[in-house]
């Protein structure tokens, strides 16, 4: 089976690598524009230069292309806690990330929010915090894991998800209550 190709891919495949087919004359292959530039005018004929212009401030192209316009630079999402790791240049988009001791939680393929890495207070670090993964904590005795924080078993009530983890403490409380009744 032949994979489906879009019109642009079909046209480009006729020309050697680094060239594209002239939109008005399919017998002409024009040289693509370098990254950091965009197509201003197609080459007038075979062996003649394509008219490429540098991207203006606030825009970029990251690879060779025959785009009529440069792409707009991304903006880091402050409301998501994002910070700028590197600013946009004519040939590279803005790189956004999180501050030190934070990790990325992706709400969608391209959109992430920054959250603080768990410190594992009242526990130990099982796996260190990574770019896209919070710290994994192991809690000390008398504590249970809740949203990756170690919480005292005194906050655990019966019938909640912590019951099994805090079973000895709950049994002790229950025993004390029982011994107090006549």
């Amino acid at each position: 089976l032949v994979p489906h190709l879009g019109d642009r891919e079909k046209r480009d495949s006729v020309c050697p690598q680094g060239k594209y087919i002239h939109p008005q004359n399919n017998s002409i292959c024009c040289t693509k524009c370098h990254k950091g530039t965009y197509l201003y005018n197609d080459c007038p004929g075979p062996g003649q230069d394509t008219d490429c212009r540098e991207c203006e401030s606030g825009s970029f192209t990251a690879s060779e292309n025959h785009l009529r316009h440069c792409l707009s630079c991304s903006k880091c999402r402050k409301e998501m806690g994002q910070v700028e790791i590197s600013s946009c240049t004519v040939d590279r988009d803005t790189v956004c990330g999180c501050r030190k001791n934070q990790y990325r939680h992706y709400w969608s393929e391209n959109l992430f929010q920054c959250f603080n890495c768990s410190l594992c207070l009242n526990g130990t670090v099982h796996l260190s915090c990574q770019e896209k993964q919070n710290t994994v904590c192991t809690c000390h005795a008398g504590f249970f894991l809740r949203e990756n924080e170690c919480v005292s078993c005194s906050n655990c009530k019966k019938s909640l998800e912590c019951t099994k983890l805090c079973l000895p403490q709950i049994e002790n409380v229950k025993g004390t209550e029982d011994s107090g009744t006549t």
Epitope: Y103, H105, Y106, W107, F115, S118, Q130, K132, Q133, N134, R146, E147, N148, L160, E161, C162
Partner: nanobody, 120 residues
Framework: EVQLLESGGGLVQPGGSLRLSCAAS????????MGWVRQAPGKGLGWVSA????????YYADSVRGRFTISRDNSKNTLYLQMNSLRAEDTAVYYC?????????????RGQGTLVTVSS
């Protein structure tokens, strides 16, 4: 056993409003981020909105920001989604979900869903 039960879906005209509710049980509701994911016909699941346990922090997808409002009532173990200025592209099954932060899948539990249809 974690249970999430959505209600409030239905047929509404473009520009109209709906309020979705999600009754949660089987876990300590106030401890966790909660949210709404939706699945439009023939499309994948996507986050619409989410809210932290205290309600102090929220997330909205760009497509719904300014139109939808997420809220919660921890005393009632209930999550809400107020949807205003509804559009045809908001037509989807809406699921209440318990957010899983920290890597891996985005939620560890979700309900059965409630269908929202926006059509004239």
């Amino acid at each position: 056993e974690v249970q999430l039960l959505e209600s409030g879906g239905g047929l509404v005209q473009p520009g109209g409003s709906l309020r979705l509710s999600c009754a949660a049980s089987g876990f300590t509701f106030e401890w966790y981020w909660m949210g709404w994911v939706r699945q439009a016909p023939g499309k994948g699941l996507g986050w619409v909105s989410a809210i932290s346990g205290s309600g102090g922090s929220t997330y909205y997808a760009d497509s719904v920001r300014g139109r939808f409002t997420i809220s919660r009532d921890n005393s009632k173990n209930t999550l809400y989604l107020q949807m205003n200025s509804l559009r045809a592209e908001d037509t989807a099954v809406y699921y209440c979900a318990k957010v899983k932060l920290g890597g891996g899948p985005n939620f560890d539990y979700r309900g059965q869903g409630t269908l929202v249809t926006v059509s004239s």
